[in-house]
Interface confidence: low
């Protein structure tokens, strides 16, 4: 009985199409597949950023795969051919591994890359990124931001930079059509007459960096002798009501501070007849049903009630 062997895939490579971290892994079928014409050969692909403890593993019949990587680090990948047991009258047969690596050769020392990169998607409408120049870069250094997400033909450069003393320190993005719930890739590189500048790569999803506007139209309504209902409205904009969480801060008679997190636009508060003053503020955040993360809005304007008969008052901000 001759042992069945299969070769690894040929021409295994990682191709960078210029999408700032979204890479193509591609290969060709192994040599000498003639005796397995009736078989559908599969490939097991493993890949990771260098330094990562875990490999991502994919089994596919295709000759390519695409995924996002952190280009601040190198990438390593390996692939082998799998012959399913149906092809071999027995157990699955695996080839040896074909391996490849990819990295962008770093320019300049790490201290030259941008510091404290911060991106916020305001009200799920306007993306703004800001950064500080690298520690110790000269004042002639300027940074440029490029971005890409699936749907764009190629990476685009920022066209509306935020500047300080003539140096780019941020970017206001244009309207980004169909850009949420997918990886958004950014590269900030730099130029200087004197020094090579290290590039920085960032990847995030826009829905996870949303900072909503604060709630508006805060009101009080007396529900009973010992209950007051606090109400507010969601801010204008594209974020649906179902996507909000709220945090309320309530102060009674300048002493008791109540904080609570709720999922809808009302909160019922137990009070005593002695309550002379009631103030509250609310802020909003995109909830776990619509994103994995988010940023609290600013607090709303404070709404206060002072006086005798709360039942006769409905205050509108």
């Amino acid at each position: 009985d001759t042992e069945i062997k299969v070769n690894p895939p040929q021409d295994f490579e990682i191709v960078d199409p210029g999408y700032l971290g979204y890479l193509y892994l591609q290969w060709q079928p192994p040599l000498s597949l003639d005796h397995f014409k009736e078989c559908t050969v599969e490939y097991e692909l493993k890949y990771r950023n260098i330094g990562s403890e875990t490999w991502k593993t994919i089994i596919t019949k295709n000759l390519h795969y695409k995924d996002g990587f952190d280009l601040n680090k190198g990438i390593e990948a390996k692939i082998h051919t799998l012959l399913p047991w149906q092809c071999t009258n027995g157990s699955e047969v695996q080839s040896s591994w074909a391996e490849t690596t990819y990295w962008i050769s770093p320019q300049g020392i790490p201290e030259t890359k941008v510091q404290d990169m911060d991106c916020v998607y305001y009200n799920w409408q306007y993306l703004l990124c800001s950064w500080k120049p690298g520690i110790g870069v000269l004042l002639d250094t300027n940074y440029n931001l490029f971005y890409w997400y699936e749907g764009l033909d190629h990476a685009l450069q920022c066209v509306d930079y935020i500047k300080a003393d003539g140096q780019n320190i941020g970017c206001r993005f244009p309207y980004l059509e169909a850009s949420d719930y997918k990886d958004f890739y950014i590269c900030v590189n730099g130029s200087s007459e004197n020094k090579p500048i290290r590039s920085s790569y960032f990847t995030f999803q826009l829905q996870n960096i949303v900072k909503p506007l604060p709630p508006v139209y805060l009101t009080f309504t007396r529900e009973s002798s010992c209950e007051i209902k606090l109400k507010w409205s969601i801010p204008l904009g594209p974020i649906p009501a179902r996507c909000f969480d709220y945090e309320i801060e309530i102060r009674e008679d300048d002493t008791t501070l109540v904080t609570a997190t709720v999922e809808n636009e009302t909160y019922t508060l137990k009070t005593t007849n002695e309550t002379r003053q009631l103030c509250f503020v609310v802020r909003s955040k995109v909830n776990i049903y619509c994103s994995d993360d988010g940023i609290w809005s600013e607090w709303s304007d404070k709404q206060c009630w002072e006086g005798e008969d709360l039942s006769k008052k409905t205050l509108l901000r």
């Epitope: 020392i109 201290e111 030259t112 520690i135 110790g136 300080a164 004197n194 020094k195």
Partner: antibody, heavy 119, light 111 residues
Framework: QVQLVQSGAEVKKPGASVKVSCKAS????????MNWVRQAPGQGLEWMGR????????HYNQKFKDRVTMTRDTSTSTVYMELSSLRSEDTAVYYC????????????WGQGTLVTVSS | DIQLTQSPSSLSASVGDRVTITCRAS??????????MNWFQQKPGKAPKLLIY???RQGSGDPARFSGSGSGTDFTLTISSLQPEDFATYFC?????????FGGGTKVEIK
């Protein structure tokens, strides 16, 4: 490890010139600036200027502008500081000090070269 | 030129003491959110040694007892618990503007 090794002590007469060398090793020479700082006996520190080892660009302290010349030789990773028209008040220890740009600090220093100007 | 005034010019302290040295600049040394202020230690007959850069970032390999703070024109170097090897002269230095300038130094002596 990073090392900056300077040339030996010099005794010069007023009006002469002195050229101090600083040989760098243990890092990528062209990624950094080299600063020159001097210290008169019992005095504080005085920055004279710097040279970019990558492009050769120099920034001099105006006080020394007409008398100081800084050069570098990338093939030997060596920086030179020449001070001309010496006077007795130039008697000092001269240090080379590596730095990356403006805010990174001068993080490695040579051992110093004593230049004595005396008639 | 930006002038740097260090105080005190000298101080006597004991091992274990907390020591604070201040440096005042004649104008702000901040730019782009970075304070261009560095601190050095120098022992007799030796080259200066970088302790703190960018006002508060520690030089590599420096003990955690050295810390820097401040922004704008007022900066502080703090030694949280003075050790025998810390008796030396300390200089502040600005690198916002050429010519870079140093403070006059603070000599820390054994009480």
């Amino acid at each position: 490890q990073v090392q900056l090794v300077q040339s030996g002590a010099e005794v010069k007469k007023p009006g002469a010139s002195v050229k101090v060398s600083c040989k760098a090793s243990g890092y990528t020479f062209t990624n950094y600036w080299m600063n020159w700082v001097r210290q008169a006996p019992g005095q504080g520190l005085e920055w004279m200027g710097r040279i970019d080892a990558y492009a050769g660009e120099t920034h001099y302290n105006q006080k020394f502008k007409d008398r100081v010349t800084m050069t570098r030789d990338t093939s030997t990773s060596t920086v030179y500081m020449e001070l001309s028209s010496l006077r007795s008040e130039d008697t000092a220890v001269y240090y080379c000090a590596r730095g990356y740009g403006d805010a990174y600090g001068m993080d490695h220093w040579g051992q110093g070269t004593l230049v004595t100007v005396s008639s | 030129d930006i002038q740097l005034t260090q105080s005190p010019s000298s101080l006597s302290a004991s091992v274990g003491d907390r020591v604070t040295i201040t440096c005042r600049a004649s104008e702000s040394v901040d730019n782009y959110g970075i304070s261009f202020m560095n601190w050095f230690q120098q022992k007799p007959g030796k080259a200066p040694k970088l302790l703190i850069y960018a006002a508060s970032r520690q030089g590599s390999g420096d003990p955690a007892r050295f810390s820097g703070s401040g922004s704008g024109t007022d900066f502080t170097l703090t030694i949280s618990s003075l050790q025998p090897e810390d008796f030396a002269t300390y200089f502040c230095q600005q690198s916002k503007e050429v010519p870079w300038t140093f403070g006059g130094g603070t000599k820390v002596e054994i009480k």
